[in-house]
């Protein structure tokens, strides 16, 4: 099954992908896409390189490593739950069916907030959006967003989150790199 990487809402996510150029500067086209790798190309392309440069990218997606040396790892800036999913890194080696394909699973963990002191069963009239920062609804009922009438306290800072040993272990075990900035 696909390798899993984790990041938290508001952080940058890192999805590793590497190849070794046959000779310095002898680059191979690479594409990154959302969704599992199809038979050819990438679906829902977010970034593409050619033999010389990055020739297509979309906002929040960039290559932070030295892609001229084969580090085509993808950084996704300021992630939300909507960034969860399978990402395809496809190294487009010349020749028929020579491509190297990697499906990487990105799990975005909701950020922690302090629950508002309200009762659990008040939470029946509506439901928050699921594709935004996770907040707390009434006490003990954690949700994936916020209702208009629920006040959220400020989301913990990245530094505080990294003190959470469980999250730190998740990141270490999955090999994910969290970049601050």
């Amino acid at each position: 099954s696909e390798v899993e990487y984790r990041a938290e809402v508001g952080q940058n996510a890192y999805l590793p992908c590497f190849y070794t150029p046959a000779a310095p500067g002898n680059l191979v086209p690479v594409c990154w896409g959302k969704g599992a790798c199809p038979v050819f190309e990438c679906g829902n392309v977010v970034l593409r390189t050619d033999e010389r440069d990055v020739n297509y990218w979309t906002s929040r997606y960039w290559l932070n490593g030295d892609f001229r040396k084969g580090d085509v790892s993808l950084t996704i800036e300021n992630v939300t739950l909507a960034d969860s999913g399978i990402y395809c890194c496809r190294i487009q080696i010349p020749g028929i069916m020579n491509d190297e394909k990697f499906n990487l699973k990105l799990v975005i963990k909701p950020a922690k907030v302090t629950p508002a002191p309200t009762r659990q069963r008040d939470f029946t009239a509506a439901f928050p959006r699921m594709l935004t920062t996770r907040g707390h609804g009434p006490a003990e009922t954690q949700t994936l967003g916020s209702l208009p009438d629920i006040n959220l306290t400020q989301i913990s800072t990245l530094a505080n989150e990294l003190r959470d040993s469980r999250l730190a272990n998740d990141l270490r075990d999955s090999g994910a790199t969290i970049r601050i900035g």
């Epitope: 799990v107 439901f127 959006r129 996770r134």
Partner: antibody
Framework: EVQLQQSGAEVVRPGALVKLSCKAS????????MHWVRQRPEQGLEWIGW????????IYDPKFQDRASITADTSSNTAYLQLSSLTSEDTAVYYC????????????WGQGTLVTVSA | DIVMTQSQEFMSTSVGDRVSITCKAS??????VAWYQQKPGQSPKLLIY???NRYTGVPDRFTGTGSGTDFTLTINNMQSEDLADYFC???????TFGGRTKLEIK
């Protein structure tokens, strides 16, 4: 390998309650939301609710809010659904499912447990 | 509730056909839609998430499109193993599923 092993079929009386189990292997349930979905005979799927086993927080469809209780035991890596005040309308296959990771599309499903409510 | 409506309960098809299954949300759900396939006696299987992203192991002939309220699952070059029930699901609010669309052979 990820697997969700559900408890066996149940036949229960109207008005009674049933408690179903879902034992997970191949992953730690604390890292995902665990969902329960049901399917009545020859019908579509109905989402009942989910639990975040890391902190026991739950969300239910309002339709099931007063009758359903989802719990989890992280020591045995098992999720549970208890449904009370059963009627014949609750006759269905009940599935537990694991989401992708904090988003509610369901990647892994148990084999289902048939609950028959009959006098 | 956000109601997901699959207007075609049954669809007749032949091997090699291009089949489009539609799903309409009662309100805007952006792209927070998944599609599932269920064969007789089996549990559902995830095909598409976020409206258009194929899950791992799903053949390229399955394509999802749409955003807002209108969504489509297309099967290009229908195969006999694709005969099954198909469900859409939104997860913009608490999850709700469409009724079902059963694909049958003509």
């Amino acid at each position: 390998e990820v697997q969700l092993q559900q408890s066996g079929a149940e036949v229960v009386r109207p008005g009674a309650l049933v408690k179903l189990s879902c034992k997970a292997s191949g992953f730690n349930i604390k890292d995902y939301y665990m969902h329960w979905v049901r399917q009545r005979p020859e019908q579509g799927l109905e989402w009942i609710g989910w639990i975040d086993p890391e902190n026991d927080n739950t969300i239910y469809d309002p339709k099931f809010q007063d009758r359903a209780s989802i719990t989890a035991d992280t020591s045995s890596n098992t999720a549970y659904l208890q449904l009370s005040s059963l009627t014949s309308e609750d006759t269905a296959v009940y599935y537990c499912a694991r989401d992708f990771g904090y988003v509610a599309w369901l990647v892994y499903w148990g084999q289902g447990t048939l609950v028959t409510v009959s006098a | 509730d956000i109601v997901m409506t699959q207007s075609q309960e049954f669809m007749s098809t032949s091997v090699g056909d291009r089949v489009s299954i539609t799903c309409k949300a009662s309100q805007n759900v952006d792209t927070a839609v998944a599609w599932y396939q269920q064969k007789p006696g089996q549990s559902p299987k995830l095909l598409i998430y976020s409206a258009s992203n194929r899950y791992t192991g799903v053949p390229d002939r399955f394509t999802g499109t749409g955003s807002g309220t209108d969504f489509t699952l297309t099967i290009n070059n229908m195969q006999s193993e694709d005969l099954a029930d198909y469900f859409c699901q939104q997860y913009s609010s608490y999850p709700t599923f469409g009724g079902r669309t059963k694909l049958e052979i003509k």
